[in-house]
């Protein structure tokens, strides 16, 4: 049975230029955590797996950075990068949970943080 | 072209170890994950896990963990697959694919021939 | 796991004949992470399909794949007599990767 919950940073607003911090937390179970996927609507942007380490798309290596912890740092950021982002979270034995951001991306500098928000 | 050339076929005892090799040409070996995938007589496909192309990184399924040992030697191109404590269950054919990717994407691009390993008393 | 079910077990159909395989995931399976592989007898399995649709390097046009989530089929538009051999979907989305218990397409 699946128990746990993600915890992530919700909806979110940035500057143009600027740079964001995506996070996710899983929490409420003790299944162990084999590897993270982070998709920008169906395109995989980065992945941290348990024990092979991180890997960055080529295509977003110039401005994606693993981390804080299984987070993902997003920089140079363009009004092209507003819109939905995963966390996708491979469990063993639970399976699969997912956690949704919405990042818009702000001409302005009245870039304000959403709150945070739980995906059962 | 992409060459997986593997080892030839072994006949082991229960209890006992074997390991199978795979000498990889034809590509850059030093950039590309080497998966291992086992085959029982009449059965499906099954991965069993992943090597890094530094010999630094390894993932294993947790049916083999602890078992399993995946090693490279980068000097001969070649991938190697221990598996230890066999019981005849573990009596089938494994095979070496590399990765499609540059990171361990899962997709088995392509494969060695198989290497037959009987497990018997 | 990901447990991935084929259907029919074994398809028995006549060169020329168009077949449809099929591929039902345990759980949806994100931005199509699926394979699709060929193995005739005595062979190591070739790679056909992967992203669901896109065909591998030198596989014919007459193989072709297609579905999202949980569904995903494969067709082959007129069989020829080379295509008859066993069939296996496996999705590369979830740790760790699986494989379907494979399709049979044999001649009629």
């Known amino acids: 049975m699946m128990t746990g919950t993600i915890e992530t940073t919700g909806n979110i607003s940035a500057e143009k230029g600027g740079s964001i911090i995506l996070q996710c937390h899983l929490s409420s179970t003790t299944a162990q955590v084999t590897q993270v996927n982070w998709e920008q609507q169906d395109q995989l942007l980065a992945i941290c797996n348990a024990d092979l380490g991180w890997h960055i798309s080529p295509s977003f290596k110039d401005r994606v950075a693993p981390g804080p912890g299984l987070g993902l740092t997003l920089q140079s950021l363009t009004v092209n990068d507003t819109g939905e982002y995963f966390c996708i979270y491979h469990t063993y034995p639970d399976g699969t949970y997912t956690g949704r951001i919405f990042l818009e991306v702000l001409e302005s500098s009245v870039a304000e943080h959403g709150a945070r928000f739980q995906i059962p | 072209q992409v060459q997986l050339v593997q080892s030839g076929a072994e006949v082991k005892k229960p209890g006992a170890s074997v390991k199978v090799s795979c000498k990889a040409s034809?590509?850059?070996?030093?950039?590309?994950?080497m998966h291992w995938v086992r085959q029982a007589p009449g059965q499906g496909l099954e991965w069993m896990g992943v090597i890094g192309p530094s010999g630094a990184s390894t993932s294993y399924a947790q049916k083999f963990q602890g078992r399993v040992t995946m090693t490279r030697d980068t000097s001969t191109s070649t991938v190697y697959m221990e598996l230890s404590s066999l019981r005849s269950e573990d009596t089938a054919v494994y095979y070496c694919?590399?990765?499609?990717?540059?990171?361990?994407?899962?997709?088995?691009?392509?494969w060695g021939q198989g290497t037959m390993v009987t497990v018997s008393s | 796991e990901i447990v991935l079910t084929q259907s029919p077990g074994t398809l028995s159909l006549s060169p020329g004949e168009r077949a449809t395989l099929s591929c039902r995931a345990s759980q949806s399976v994100r931005s199509s992470y699926l394979a699709w592989y060929q193995q005739k007898p005595g062979q190591a399995p070739r790679l056909l399909i992967y992203?669901?649709?896109s065909r591998a390097t030198g596989i014919p046009d007459r193989f072709s794949g297609s579905g999202s989530g949980t569904d995903f089929t494969l067709t082959i538009s007129r069989l020829e007599p080379e295509d008859f051999a066993v069939y296996y979907c496996?999705?590369?989305?979830?740790?760790?990767?699986?494989f379907g218990g494979g399709t049979k397409v044999e001649i009629k």
């Open positions: 992203g669901a649709s």
């Open positions: 694919a590399r990765d499609h990717s540059d990171y361990w994407s899962g997709i088995l691009h392509s």
């Open positions: 034809g590509y850059t070996f030093e950039k590309y994950y």
């Open positions: 496996q999705q590369y989305f979830s740790p760790p990767w699986t």
